[in-house]
Interface confidence: low
């Protein structure tokens, strides 16, 4: 069979950017593009994404957001450019190459989007005294994939007690995360929320510092 090569690791692409799904083959010395049949398709549904046959680019069948690298095809570069990446693009794409023989390989696209700096709210937010039970809410928006949320005190020690975290996908598939910490106030202290994107290994931090009265929130970065 024809050897078709793709990267082993998933291609990570930020939402809204362009991604290149690399695929290559080794053409014979006498190879001409007229002999080439190239098909990119979604691995799971077999939906056609892009194709090249009969010596010419047959175009995108995938929302007109794909392109080949025509000047590089003759050298065995069958890579696909996917423009304006969306969450819904995540998954496995298969590159089929047929000349005399044929071969195929699948490449995974992992989509990612950074989470916004968390906004922090505190309830109740006045007349607080040590020993009071308060609810601190950390909200971060439009990230992907689902976040990991961690709470810490001012010394960096984890706060794992009464935490409720919910994540909701919007119409674009991006997640809004809301994490609620219920905690008994100490004499003073800082409560930090860390929202981690597991793919980008990106951390977004928010914190609220309680120093008696009044409550102070750090300025937004």
């Amino acid at each position: 069979a024809l050897e078709v090569q793709v990267p082993e690791d998933p291609v990570v692409a930020l939402v809204g950017t362009d991604a290149t799904l690399r695929c290559s083959f080794s053409p014979e010395p006498d190879f001409s593009l007229a002999q080439l049949n190239l098909i990119w398709q979604l691995t799971d549904t077999k939906q056609l994404v892009h194709s090249f046959s009969e010596g010419r680019d047959q175009g995108s069948a995938y929302a007109n957001r794909t392109a080949l690298f025509p000047d590089l095809l003759a050298q065995g570069n069958a890579s696909l450019r996917l423009q304006r990446v969306r969450v819904a693009d995540e998954g496995s794409f298969t590159c089929f190459v047929s000349i005399r023989d044929f071969g195929s390989a699948a490449v995974s696209l992992q989509v990612a989007a950074p989470y916004s700096k968390p906004s922090m709210t505190l309830e109740p937010n006045k007349d607080l005294r040590p020993g009071d039970m308060v609810t601190i809410t950390c909200s971060s928006y439009r990230g992907y994939p689902e976040a990991e949320v961690f709470w810490q005190d001012g010394q960096g020690a984890p706060l794992t007690g009464n935490v409720t975290t919910s994540q909701m996908a919007n119409e674009q598939g991006l997640f809004d995360v809301r994490s609620v910490l219920r905690v008994v106030l100490g004499a003073n202290g800082t409560y930090s929320c860390l929202v981690r994107n597991p793919v980008l290994q990106q951390d977004a931090h928010g914190s609220v510092t309680i120093t008696g009265q009044p409550m102070t929130f750090p300025p937004e970065a």
Partner: antibody, heavy 120, light 107 residues
Amino acid sequence: QVQLQQSGAELARPGASVKLSCKASGYTFTSYWMQWVKQRPGQGLEWIGTIYPGDGDTRYTQKFKGKATLTADKSSSTAYMQLSSLASEDSAVYYCARRGIPRLWYFDVWGAGTTVTVSS
Amino acid sequence: DIQMTQTTSSLSASLGDRVTISCRASQDISNYLNWYQQKPDGTVKLLIYYTSRLHSGVPSRFSGSGSGTDYSLTIDNLEQEDIATYFCQQGNTLPPTFGGGTKLEIK
């Protein structure tokens, strides 16, 4: 909170049809593919097919083409599966399940299952 | 269709043990491997998706690993509430297919 509520147990005669329902709440019903999965007593799980309620697009595994028909009602956020020409091998628990992130075929929320018993 | 094989159909372990459940695919599934827990009452829950990503709300004692055709689910410090049947499922190619399940029991 995201929930899938399935209809109650069904007892049916061989050759008859049944229509199972799965009511979704807590999320945008039209944005997620809904799956149906079969489990025979003491057996593993078997994927039947999926429907995208936003436009009614469906996919079936070969074995269940002609046996199962998937539909969805956007107004009531309810997915349905009709099983026709019932036979004893259709006796099973049927689950509906929401597919998670687009393009990743995992099922993040499951209904409690509906038991279908086919008996004469 | 891709065949998923869980060679161990039942497994006995003691509370506090570390338990590993294996799953093999009939071909490379590019890490598109998910794990589910089915309790004796029939309730099914997603534990891990894409080989190692812990689903929201799942205790951190559950972890997943693997690549190519061989994957595993590990439960550290086994608890009574972990008594269930565990299924693997590939999501690389339609139709999605499940392993036969591994029933976990207490010694």
